[in-house]
Interface confidence: medium
């Protein structure tokens, strides 16, 4: 059974992940971002189901495409550090989902834009956090 300290750690890691995903989304939605239209042409795979921490496998598998899109989107008005940012997110995802169980991610038939993709995982984080508090 999870202890209160492990639950607290999980909650903090989820909050960390949530904030980083929100930062990316805020950057993309920034009124100054000139490459938003182009960014929306890239398609991301969405999880068929995302209700447990093991489902973060689906996010992990899409981190490389996310990094590539963020790299392409770099401009004067949209400056992130994709390599470091995605590396930070990857570390949290690995810690949260654990490496003990091998979970095969199932994806939905419909692909999504980067905005829809980020919103989906932001909602996931918020949902899990609410069950922990």
């Amino acid at each position: 059974a999870p202890t209160s300290s492990s639950t607290k750690k999980t909650q903090l890691q989820l909050e960390h992940l949530l904030l980083d995903l929100q930062m990316i989304l805020n950057g993309i939605n920034n009124y100054k971002n000139p490459k938003l239209t182009r960014m929306l042409t890239f398609k991301f795979y969405m999880p068929k189901k995302a209700t447990e921490l093991k489902h973060l496998q689906c996010l992990e598998e899409e981190l490389k495409p996310l990094e590539e899109v963020l790299n392409l989107a770099q401009s004067k008005n949209f400056h992130l550090r994709p390599r470091d940012l995605i590396s930070n997110i990857n570390v949290i995802v690995l810690e949260l989902k654990g490496s003990e169980t091998t979970f095969m991610c199932e994806y939905a038939d419909e692909t999504a834009t980067i905005v829809e993709f980020l919103n989906r995982w932001i909602t996931f984080c918020q949902s899990i956090i609410s069950t922990l508090t």
Epitope: M23, H79, P82
Partner: antibody, heavy 121, light 110 residues
Framework: QLQLQESGPGLVKPSQTLSLTCTVS??????????WSWIRQHPGKGLEWIGY???????YYSPSLKSRVTISVDTSKNQFSLKLSSVTAADTAVYYC?????????????WGRGTLVTVSS | NFMLTQPHSVSESPGKTVTISCTRS????????VQWYQQRPGSSPTTVIY?????PSGVPDRFSGSIDSSSNSASLTISGLKTEDEADYYC?????????FGGGTKLTVL
Amino acid sequence: QLQLQESGPGLVKPSQTLSLTCTVSGGSISSGGYYWSWIRQHPGKGLEWIGYIYKSGSAYYSPSLKSRVTISVDTSKNQFSLKLSSVTAADTAVYYCARTPTVTGDWFDPWGRGTLVTVSS
Amino acid sequence: NFMLTQPHSVSESPGKTVTISCTRSSGSIASNYVQWYQQRPGSSPTTVIYEDNQRPSGVPDRFSGSIDSSSNSASLTISGLKTEDEADYYCQTYDSIDVYFGGGTKLTVL
């Protein structure tokens, strides 16, 4: 208005770890939209970026210092901290903390008053 | 990696106009925003220009910034020089890996 204040030991022995804290007042680290940065200036010399951190705890470091630097954040205390390990005399400098926008580019405003750290035995 | 090169020092009389250059050694100066900081002796830097040509509130319009792609340089121009403008000025930019500062220019108001 937002103010930043550095604090920590002014003297550190070679090979030890330099530890500094920046306390933010007049605004909240948790409000988002900004990274929180450390920059240093060697005596009589130019400025050097060390790294910055987001409220989430995600940190980004200068490639030249990455192996020795750790930046952490404590949103409950409205503080962020710098640790620089294995210091030498070359790390003697005035250390500044500053605020940086997250998306529209890396620049620094406002800056703290700075704190001089001397590395000497 | 690249470098930002500034003149070591410039001097001009009160009331005149002075321009400080900042040349990027490789890559386009226009690809990322350039900032300028003023540092008076014994004080911390303050921003006088951000995002190439934007002035923070409280900075007089005597200060202006520009980018010249042909010379791959940025410039800080100060008109109507005052003795209080005497300070070190640093340009600064960044890329997806690092942050870069120029070596600084000492402005002397004669």
